[in-house]
């Protein structure tokens, strides 16, 4: 039960995280005009990964896409790449984890297969979260560097009284969304990996022995029925009516002196 809960929670947390990564990637407010200690302007500038926007006091907002690929800073391209890789890995991870969920029955899928899929999706979520965190952190570092550079050159003299105030940019909402979303995806991935350990069938050091009741060809397996969720085919605990003595692995067992009661 705890395994199912951990797996389910991991899936939900990762789903929220990936939705957040997608939202952050699409958001325009990766960097916003710094309003602190600056002259109050009637224009507010903010920039995203794909376009830059200007909101005027009049209420008019104008956005312009970055229609060049080669003209963009390498760091911005790297951040775009990291975010896209994060989204793609996360999306694949979600797809895989849906089939890995213990509460979803797909044919006669073995628990071991579900465990492997859970581990795969967990790793994908971890990498996806790390990509998002890395992307956002690279962008944040770029902002900090530019912020202090523009602060050093805050007022560029243009001769006499005339001055040009450089627009400084600070952290936008998308950065915080990205960090939180990346963290959630990472946590979700770790939960999936933890759930995988509980899903993996425990190896036993003995062969299950069949006891044949006289008059009935019913195989009895020691250890009783394991607790199950009620979903999925419980192949390891099914009764065998074919009259043959079978092991846990469905391999023919030869009678020994202890076989019959």
């Amino acid at each position: 039960m705890a395994v199912t809960a951990c797996q389910g929670l991991g899936f939900v947390v990762s789903l929220i995280g990936i939705a957040g990564i997608i939202a952050a990637t699409c958001m325009d407010q990766w960097s916003t005009q710094d309003l602190y200690n600056n002259p109050v302007t009637a224009v507010f500038n903010y920039q995203g990964l794909w376009r830059s926007c200007v909101r005027e006091s009049s209420g008019f907002t104008e956005c312009r896409g970055y229609f060049t690929l080669l003209g963009l800073p390498a760091m911005l391209q790297a951040v775009r790449a990291l975010m896209i890789v994060g989204i793609v890995l996360g999306a694949i991870g979600l797809l895989v984890s849906i089939f890995a969920l213990k509460c979803i029955r797909i044919g006669s899928m073995e628990d071991s297969a579900k465990a492997n899929m859970t581990l795969t999706s967990g790793i994908m979520f971890i990498v996806s979260g790390l990509c998002a965190i890395a992307g956002v952190s690279v962008f944040a570092n770029m902002l900090v560097t530019n912020f202090w550079m523009s602060t050093a050159n805050m007022y560029t003299g243009m001769g006499g009284m005339v001055q040009t105030v450089q627009t400084r940019y600070t952290f936008g909402a998308a950065l915080f969304v990205g960090w939180v979303a990346g963290g959630l995806t990472l946590i979700g991935g770790v939960m999936m990996c933890i759930a995988c350990r509980g899903l993996a069938p425990e190896e036993t050091n003995y062969k299950a022995v069949s006891y044949h009741a006289s008059g009935h060809s019913v195989a009895y397996k020691p250890g009783g029925f394991k607790a199950s969720t009620g979903f999925g085919s419980n192949t390891k605990n099914k009764k065998i009516y074919d009259g043959g003595a079978r092991t846990e692995d469905e391999v023919q067992s030869y009678p020994s002196k202890h076989d019959y009661v």
């Epitope: 002259p39 302007t41 200007v54 209420g59 005339v162």
Partner: antibody, heavy 120, light 112 residues
Amino acid sequence: EVMLVESGGGLVKPGGSLKLSCAASGFTFSSYTMSWVRQTPEKRLEWVATIIGGYGNTYYADSVKGRFTISRDSAKNTLYLQMISLRSEDTALYYCTRLGQTQRNAMDYWGQGTSVTVSS
Amino acid sequence: DILMTQSPSSLSVSAGEKVTMSCKSSQSLLNSGNQKNYLAWYQQKPGQPPKLLIYGASTRESGVPDTFTGSGSGTDFTLTISSVQAEDLAVYYCQNDYYYPFTFGAGTKLEL
């Protein structure tokens, strides 16, 4: 047709109060940024205050900060300017203006103005 | 506050003449985000409120004759009337639309 009609001006003693109104019509009042601009007897134009459309943020000229309050009633399509502690230098023709949404913050419509005289 | 300096303060012209007036701001009105200048020009005739002529330093407001041209960038701006008509006699004001407080120039009076 866009119309801005100011009212509420008059003669007031120094230290007195006055509330100007501006009735707007012909456009979606709540979504536009509105301003008050005054013209002194020397014909100089002075921006007084601005209220941002939608957000409601307000900005004031340093000379009126703490004394004047700009507000709006979107239900009545009316802009207000509450003026207290009036001084003789506040004597002017007060215009109600609208900031055009595609005009780079420029004031595309102006009312006819209402006169405020502060004198003892 | 941004200081807007207009010159000349008055200008005597004849009909059909080309007129140029200047406006200088103490700080750049060019926004780096969209590379637009936030400067407007207004025309005020006696007994009337100001009327918007040019916004964004160079864009004519609808209904304004093409004899009016705005130009300039950053801190130096110019309003040109290619052929002055009698109805153009008025006071022309430039305005900073970029920084609060919005500030106006003292005006350039166009007279015969």
